[in-house]
Interface confidence: low
């Protein structure tokens, strides 16, 4: 139903759910910090811009007592339960910020009447794909999608020769919520991945994927998998692999594959880490001094949620708008702001996009090193390093299906 | 506005124990993670010992099997049983809290942190262990 919103007369206000059901586990207290530090900097853009006016945030805490799970298996509901104490307490900003888990978002945008722009730090899944007034600041799965049917199909590069048409996705259950999404997306029967592959077969028992490590019957050299190096030691271990055999590990929100200290262990020789572009400045920030690497990007997408209301109300502001109109609610797509750690792109249905980048593990350093960048806004590949120096024979990717010629 | 008050910090000799208590006041968050983190002169900050608010305990291997955390709900009290101390024991002991929106997971995962991040502080209580 209509809520009437705290959005008029120079007053701004900005409604975050601060949801028990999220989709990393990050103390409450970090994703304030990180708001209110988005709130300084909106303050101070505003008031450079002669703009005098006030912009605050509410924070809507969920009572925990019903959707206590803390994953985001039991967020169905909360989302619409906080929504439902917003509207009681007659206290929606001009924007919502917070569902992260795909479950609440996608509830919410379906149950609501959404006049107001939502910005949600997760809601990885396809079902949350082509919403109108859904702003997603942390990479979707569809991104992952593209890129991995781009990589499967390049078969010009020095280091890759083969076009890839199979694939094995190894998903036990146990993912986190990012890789849930993602992984699910390229299980799905009807997706973009699953559409340009001939082959595809998920594996979901450790033993499947230990056994096809070795398989001289396997139907495919790749497998994708979520999750950290720690997560692949568990599963793989010591075990000996076909020396033709590829592991993609998809790793989106972990920099510390950029440390200057990190030496990549052993068992990483035949895997091909997917991870986002490292940020310059987060490691000194004020918000980001307590977070774990991993954590970063979640905070990172609260605060940069809050410079894009920013960014969007300098705009309608300037230009004598009104703030609480449908243009408003559907205006957050299409366009680059300044984000805390440089400019921020949001496509045509107001997702993110970045610069993804696989790495490989050099033989000689036992590094890891940039092996190509892809840009999601563009759907391009970039090659880095022309000679990788790769594990696998002539330091070529093989062939997705062992014994097959060039194609 | 949250405040953490801690007492019982002393002077005991090795093989002594002590009991830390931290009063809370102002914390309203039905989820929490709470515990003792504790800095000895010239190191960074390590946790102690955290209970999250689904009764889940964390210890750090350090102290398992001589220190037990606790809580008493309706005096809003968190306490630190510390036996058979040692020299290394030696330290400032913070209690420390913070909202959490994962039970017993990320409230473990924080004894394993360096200068974990807690977003409440106590001042701090000196324990000193020494003949």
């Known amino acids: 139903s209509q809520v009437s919103q705290n959005c008029h007369n120079g007053s701004y206000e900005i409604s975050v759910l601060m949801m028990g059901n999220s989709a990393f586990a990050e103390p409450l207290k970090n994703l304030e910090d990180a708001v209110n530090e988005g709130l300084e900097i909106v303050r101070g853009r505003l008031q450079n811009a002669g703009l005098n006016v006030t912009v605050n945030a509410t924070f809507m805490y969920s009572d925990g007592l019903i959707h206590n799970s803390g994953d985001c298996r039991s967020s169905t509901c909360e989302g619409l339960d906080l929504l439902r104490k917003i509207s009681n307490a007659q206290r929606m900003g001009c924007v919502l910020i917070g569902p992260s888990c795909t479950y609440s978002t996608f509830q919410m945008y379906l149950d609501t009447e959404l006049s107001y722009p939502m910005i949600s730090a997760g809601s990885f899944g396809l079902s949350c794909d082509y919403k109108e007034t859904l702003t997603r600041l942390m990479s979707p799965a569809r991104k992952l999608m593209y890129f991995l049917v781009n990589f499967w199909k390049t078969n010009d590069l020095p280091f890759k020769t083969y076009s890839w048409s199979t694939s094995y996705v190894y998903k036990n259950g146990t993912e986190t919520e990012d890789c849930f999404w993602y992984l699910n997306a390229l299980e799905a029967s009807v997706s973009y991945f699953s559409h340009e592959l001939g082959f595809k077969v998920v594996l979901r028992q450790d033993k499947e994927f230990q056994d096809i490590l070795m398989d001289h019957n396997r139907k495919s050299n790749v497998i994708i998998m979520c999750g950290g190096p720690e997560f692949l030691y568990k599963l793989k271990g010591d075990r000996a692999v076909a020396e033709d055999i590829v592991i993609i590990l998809v790793d989106l929100f972990n920099d510390q594959y950029f440390e200057d200290n990190v030496t990549a262990p052993d068992y990483m020789k035949n895997v091909l880490v997917l991870t986002l572009s490292p940020g310059n400045s987060l490691l000194n920030s004020s918000f980001s001094r307590n977070l774990s690497p991993t954590k970063r990007d979640f905070a990172l997408a609260y605060l940069n949620g809050i410079l894009l209301f920013g960014h969007m109300l300098k705009i309608f502001l300037e230009n004598g708008e009104n703030i609480t109109t449908p243009k408003f609610a559907h205006a957050f797509r299409n366009l680059t702001f300044e984000g805390y750690d440089g400019p921020v792109t949001l496509d045509d249905w107001g997702d993110v996009d970045s610069t993804m980048v696989l790495l490989y593990t050099s033989v000689d350093t036992k590094k890891y090193k940039v092996l190509l960048t892809y840009d999601t806004h563009v759907n391009k590949t970039y090659p880095v390093d022309m000679s990788p120096t790769f594990t696998w024979k002539n330091s070529k990717l093989p062939n997705d299906i062992t014994g097959r010629g060039p194609q | 506005e949250v405040q953490l008050v801690e007492s019982g910090g002393g002077v005991v000799q090795p093989g002594g124990s002590l009991r830390l208590s931290c009063a809370a006041s102002g914390y309203t968050y039905s989820r929490y993670c709470m515990g003792w983190v504790r800095q000895a002169p010239g190191k960074e900050r390590e946790g102690v010992a955290l209970i999250a608010s689904d009764g889940t305990t964390t210890y750090a291997d350090s102290v398992k099997g001589r220190f037990t955390i606790s809580q008493d709900n309706s005096k809003n009290t968190l306490y630190l049983q510390m036996n058979s101390l040692r020299a290394e024991d030696t330290a400032v002991y913070y209690c420390?809290?913070?909202?959490?929106?994962?039970?017993?997971?990320?409230?473990?995962?924080?004894?394993?942190?360096?200068?974990?991040?807690?977003?409440?502080w106590g001042q701090g209580t000196l324990v000193t262990v020494s003949s």
């Open positions: 420390a809290a913070d909202a959490v929106n994962w039970y017993g997971s990320i409230c473990a995962s924080m004894i394993r942190r360096k200068n974990p991040a807690f977003g409440y």
